[in-house]
């Protein structure tokens, strides 16, 4: 059986049938005998009963309250009562664009991830036996499937499956022709998979420094979006008053990775700071990486090979 | 991060039954249906299967009507898919997935699990 309508707001466009579906359908079967009633307040209206004398659009059946087709003035609050079962729902009728396939309003967006399995498959139960026939446009041009009852794409997706996607089915009712059309806006964006998470520079630096002066240890990684950056330093971190972690800054890199850098800030050097890992690491599911620097007085410079200084 | 993974697959003489979980993690259960699908070597992904996790609707193909039966447990976020009777053409990575627009309906699947092999041998 077709879903009930759990959700209580919803949104159609004027011109497309529509139906209403309450969540205590079975319970309803069990009861015939029971009063079964369904009203409409809007605006300045409370509570008005529902039935197909209330206008030629509507229809009646067992658990559904149908709309043939539904109009901008069906915009309002709809119930279905039945002993003490009540089920409220929020419509709003939009504006159909008259020149698109599809009225952007009522678009659903959708990421996929380049050569990642996608499917669309264009299928409409509740009016199956109403139905004509089904199209599948892409961008509103119609694709040739040959699948022409339910058209359905499956694929790994690439750059230029990129668009908007359309599923149309045709049908008759009293002799009126309708449409009903749901679409889809598809982005393909690059592999979103996690990196492993890398510190950017060699993993020992020796800083040369002066007593009494103030030095800035910065500290970059290449990592994923819930990696974390931090520093360690010292018996216990924050002991020491004149050592201060900055902000971290994050940058989105082209590819969906952030360049994190983290800054840590010793002012007023002295000879505690000297000689001492000052360490940072970038952790994430996948495993850490550590870098380290060590404050080393200019005076001393002489004792350590050039290539290991940095700035 | 949301994810959907697969188990219960394996080797199983024909006549045989399995039962395939998916459990579901990093979005509302609710708002959700998971659908089954399976795909043999050289030919396309079909879908079996789905289930709406707001009202327990369900639909099957007219392949595995009978066979196949889908069932959840919201509290756990796992769907399953009873096979009975296993036949050597249900040989196949049966995969999960699922979608924000119901079982009944035009429809989008965006979450994949990565697959569970069945082997049917006669």
């Known amino acids: 059986a077709e879903s009930c309508t759990s959700r209580p707001h919803i949104t159609v466009v004027e011109g497309e049938p529509f139906y209403l579906k309450h969540c205590s359908c079975s319970l309803a079967h069990e009861i015939e005998t029971t009063t079964k009633s369904w009203y409409k307040s809007s605006g300045s209206q409370e509570h008005v009963e529902l039935n197909p004398r209330s206008s030629s659009r509507i229809a009646l059946h067992d658990c559904v309250l149908e709309f043939w087709p539904v109009e901008l003035n069906d915009t309002g609050s709809y119930f279905f009562q039945m002993k003490n079962y009540t089920q409220k729902w929020k419509l709003n009728v939009i504006r159909r664009n008259k020149h698109s396939c599809f009225t952007e309003r009522q678009v659903t967006s959708k990421i996929v991830e380049v050569k990642k399995f996608f499917q669309i498959t264009c299928e409409n139960s509740y009016y199956q036996t109403l139905v004509n026939s089904t199209s599948l446009y892409k961008n509103c041009k119609k694709l040739l499937l040959e699948n022409n009852k339910n058209p359905t794409i499956k694929k790994n997706a690439e750059f230029e499956d990129q668009g908007y996607y359309s599923c149309v089915h045709f049908l008759h009712h009293n002799g009126k022709l309708f449409n009903i059309t749901k679409t889809f806006n598809i982005t393909i964006v690059e592999d979103r998979s996690n990196i492993v998470p890398v510190l950017l520079g060699p993993k020992l630096n020796h800083v040369a420094v002066e007593l009494g002066k103030n030095v800035r240890l910065n500290c970059s990684a290449l990592l994923n979006e819930e990696d974390v950056i931090y520093w360690m330093f010292g018996e216990e971190n924050g002991s020491d008053p004149n050592i201060h972690e900055e902000k971290e800054m994050r940058i989105m890199t082209p590819e969906g990775k952030w360049h994190a850098s983290k800054v840590l800030r010793i002012e007023n050097i002295g000879e505690s700071n000297l000689n001492v890992l000052y360490n940072c690491t970038v952790a994430s599911t996948g495993g850490t990486d550590t870098k380290s620097f060590i404050l080393v007085r200019k005076a001393d410079m002489a004792d350590i090979p050039g290539h290991v200084f940095t700035r | 991060e949301v994810q959907l993974v697969e188990s219960g697959g394996g080797l199983v003489q024909a006549g045989g039954s399995l039962r395939l979980s998916c459990a579901a993690s990093?979005?509302?259960?609710?708002?959700?249906?998971i659908g089954w699908f399976r795909q043999a070597p050289g030919k396309e992904r079909e879908e079996v299967s789905c289930?709406?996790?707001?009202?327990?609707?369900?639909r099957y193909a007219d392949s595995v009507k009978g066979r196949f039966t889908i069932s959840s447990d919201n509290a756990k976020n796992t769907v399953y898919l009873q096979i009975d009777s296993l036949k050597p053409e249900d040989t196949a990575v049966y995969y999960c997935?699922?979608?924000?627009?119901?079982?009944?309906?035009?429809?989008?699947?965006?979450?994949w699990g990565q697959g569970t092999q069945v082997t049917v041998s006669s």
């Open positions: 990093g979005f509302t259960f609710d708002d959700y249906a």
């Open positions: 289930i709406s996790s707001s009202d327990g609707s369900t």
């Open positions: 997935a699922s979608t924000s627009e119901g079982c009944h309906d035009d429809r989008f699947y965006d979450y």
